[in-house]
């Protein structure tokens, strides 16, 4: 498992299907993004690999996703952060480790934070280590809101399909 | 809380509801997945009681979930493990859980993770000691896609029906 | 991000949207809670403030929620712990961390465990630590049924809208 | 290039105030706590406590809490510390560093005197 | 708090001579779950700031030279230069990270014979 995710050609092989109809259902906006593994120190949404998608309306734009109509959305977003042993040099203090998921929009002009997750890491007494952080919920939101994250602990993220995710569904 | 779940006598009482129609909908495909807690080293996922259910199109075939018509589905799934100290204050080396959702297509012809959670635990530091996983995400799933689950610390598992399940609905 | 959440006077601004219709959909019951933060040692739920909202039948009555209509519904919540160590490095007891959603239905008469997860934390050894849990799957509900939580630790609880959620909504 | 560079530093009558601030540059900033230390003329190297940029936690050496306050600001990858009521025996240089990859800054001089 | 003696406070040495200072601590920095000493050494000239030599009580830093060497366990600490060379002339500090307040030693100066 630590191995997560697809060798570069099995990615070419599993690119994502055709646009489908959704089961016994009206296409609803729908999205699922994933961090791109060649960037190391910075976490960049793609949609056009793996098994991301953008559907019925939903864009990426400046690393955030744009809410297609207003609505209620179910948002959600997992990371995984690693480290090795004895990373720490002349410290035993914890590294924070933190995840959020954000909002902009025209309503107020500052990002609200819809979705945090944070954990302390005490690397030199844990080596190596892991540490995963998932959320979700359901916020209604407004066509034009940006829904962004951000992230502290960005060098210690486990870039894969599987591991760091970011999306959103109609409901 | 830590004896989650029912008793045998209430988990008769308690079996799933009899199909239900969806509030304000026609039904769709979804599925709730509970680990079988009479099988303390292997990881067996059941339909037939508790709060776990079938509905419109899922079945449970070899411990894999069979998707019952194309279209986006969120897929999700927790672990909880538990353990004690191998030795008071022994050091010991850390243990690796991890847990995965896997996805096996007729379009690609092995296992590609959809979602990885991972930990490293450290016994002989914190005893005994719980951790949690959890993680959920929109895919794209074609009919006949078989939605699968790996773990590396099975024995460690607490099985209860509110800790260990695996589920799946169609958006 | 330990600030998170709104100031007073940015969630009076932030007040939840006015009932919208759903993106390409008729209305269904929904629910977002968040965690009261003025009242430090319990966890009251609230539904009138910052991006929480009951929505097509949800109601909040003795800090559950009531479901409006029978059917399939995502059951979700999410809980932020965090605390200071007793003295540094000092062995201490675990701190045993937990949150639960539950079930109270007329069918049996007790609550019945959703979904659970738990964490040992050894505050003496990790000063200062935070831990978030999370965790959400389908369920088939009866009008009428009441979900509430129950915690273990609610005094280490970092109250937020961001941070300590609870919510529901029709599939 | 990784860098620390503190700043702030000068003359500063007894019973007075001063903001020093160290700006990081080169790494990501908020998950990585920031020391402060400071080293009187002639003499040894004493720590003053830390800050975690990104959840705000602090730790101070008990001998200056009261007197040190510890801040940051993520946006401008910037921490600092404010020294109130000093003393002459407050004069020193103030570095700060990053202990989980060894970077220290080049240090600033505060003076305490009338 | 726990309290760092270095010794000698100084010392006069030659281009290739074999020096060593030492450190206790006046309580343990074992950490016994992964065997990790909570110690470090630094290395400061005049007018600089202090530079990382040692971790760990005895991992080399990136760009330490190998004669820098770093030993010991629990409460007893030694830095080794194998073969003294000019631009080791300085003052060295032990720092425990064990617990807080993070102390120092009170340095040993290194000076040319």
């Known amino acids: 498992l630590p191995g997560v995710g697809l060798t570069p050609s099995a990615a070419q092989t599993a690119r994502q299907h055709p646009k489908m109809h959704l089961a016994h259902s009206t296409l609803k906006p729908a999205a699922h993004l994933i961090g791109d593994p060649s960037k190391q120190n910075s976490l960049l949404w793609r949609a056009n690999t793996d098994r991301a998608f953008l559907q019925d309306g939903f864009s990426l734009s400046n690393n955030s996703l744009l809410v297609p109509t207003s609505g209620i959305y179910f948002v959600y977003s997992q990371v995984v952060f690693s480290g090795k042993a004895y990373s720490p040099k002349a410290t035993s203090s914890p590294l924070y480790l933190a995840h959020e998921v954000q909002l902009f929009s025209s309503q107020y002009p500052f990002h609200v934070p819809l979705l945090s997750s944070q954990k302390m890491v005490y690397p030199g007494l844990q080596e190596p280590w892991l540490h995963s952080m998932y959320h979700g919920a359901a916020f209604q939101l407004t066509q034009g809101d940006q829904l962004s994250t951000h992230t502290d602990g960005i060098p210690h993220l486990v870039l894969s399909p599987s591991t760091v995710f970011f999306g959103a569904f109609a409901l | 809380l830590p004896g989650v779940g029912l008793t045998p006598s209430a988990a008769q009482t308690a079996r799933q509801h009899p199909k239900m129609h969806l509030a304000h909908s026609t039904l769709k495909p979804a599925a709730h997945l509970i680990g079988d807690p009479s099988k303390q080293n292997s990881l067996l996922w059941r339909a037939n009681t508790d709060r776990a259910f079938l509905q419109d199109g899922f079945s449970l075939s070899n411990n894999s979930l069979l998707v019952p018509t194309s279209g986006i589905y969120f897929v999700y799934s927790q672990v909880v493990f538990s353990g004690k100290a191998y030795s008071p204050k022994a050091t010991s080396s850390p243990l690796y859980l991890a847990h995965e959702v896997q996805l096996f297509s007729s379009q690609y012809p092995f296992h590609v993770p959809l979602l990885s959670s991972q930990k490293m635990v450290y016994p002989g530091l914190q005893e005994p000691w719980l951790h949690s996983m959890y993680h959920g995400a929109a895919f794209q799933l074609t009919q006949g896609d078989q939605l699968s689950t790996h773990t590396d610390g099975i024995p460690h598992l607490v099985l209860s029906p509110s800790t260990v399940f695996f589920g799946a609905f169609a958006l | 991000l330990p600030g998170v959440g709104l100031t007073p006077s940015a969630a009076q601004t932030a007040r939840q949207h006015p009932k919208m219709h759903l993106a390409h959909s008729t209305l269904k019951p929904a629910a977002h809670l968040i965690g009261d933060p003025s009242k430090q040692n319990s966890l009251l739920w609230r539904a009138n403030t910052d991006r929480a909202f009951l929505q097509d039948g949800f109601s909040l009555s003795n800090n559950s929620l009531l479901v409006p209509t029978s059917g399939i519904y995502f059951v979700y919540s999410q809980v932020v712990f965090s605390g200071k160590a007793y003295s540094p490095k000092a062995t201490s007891s675990p701190l045993y961390l937990a949150h639960e959603v539950q079930l109270f239905s007329s069918q049996y008469p007790f609550h019945v465990p959703l979904l659970s997860s738990q964490k040992m934390v050894y505050p003496g050894l990790q000063e200062p630590w935070l831990h978030s849990m999370y965790h959400g799957a389908a369920f088939q509900l009866t009008q009428g049924d009441q979900l509430s939580t129950h915690t273990d630790g609610i005094p280490h609880l970092v109250l937020s809208p961001s941070t300590v959620f609870f919510g529901a909504f029709a599939l | 290039e990784v860098q620390l560079v503190e700043s702030g530093g000068g003359l500063v009558q007894p019973g007075g105030s001063l903001r020093l601030s160290c700006a990081a540059s080169g790494y990501t900033f908020s998950s990585y706590w920031i020391e402060w230390v400071r080293q009187a003329p002639g003499k040894g190297l004493e720590w003053v406590g830390e800050?975690?940029?990104?959840?705000?936690?602090?730790n101070y050496n008990e001998e200056f809490k009261g007197r040190a306050t510890f801040s940051a600001d993520n946006s401008k990858n910037t921490a600092y510390l404010q020294m109130n009521s000093l003393r002459a025996e407050d004069t020193a240089v103030y570095y700060c560093?990053?202990?989980?990859?060894?970077?220290w800054g080049q240090g600033t001089l505060v003076t305490v005197s009338s | 708090d726990i309290q760092m003696t270095q010794s000698p406070s100084s010392l006069s040495a030659s281009v290739g001579d074999r020096v060593t200072i030492t450190c206790k601590s006046s309580?343990?920095?074992?950490?016994?779950?992964?065997?990790?000493?909570?110690l470090a050494w630094y290395q400061q000239k005049p007018g600089k700031a202090p530079k990382l030599l040692i971790y760990w009580a005895s991992t080399r830093d990136s760009g330490v030279p190998s004669r820098f060497s770093g030993s010991g366990s629990g409460t007893d600490f030694t830095l080794t230069i194998s073969s003294l060379q000019p631009e080791d002339f300085a003052t060295y500090y032990c720092q425990q990270y064990y617990s807080y307040p993070r102390t120092f030693g009170q340095g040993t100066k290194v000076e040319i014979k």
């Open positions: 560093a990053d202990g989980y990859h060894g970077y």
């Open positions: 800050i975690s940029p990104g959840s705000g936690s602090t």
């Open positions: 309580q343990s920095l074992l950490y016994s779950t992964n065997q990790a000493n909570f």
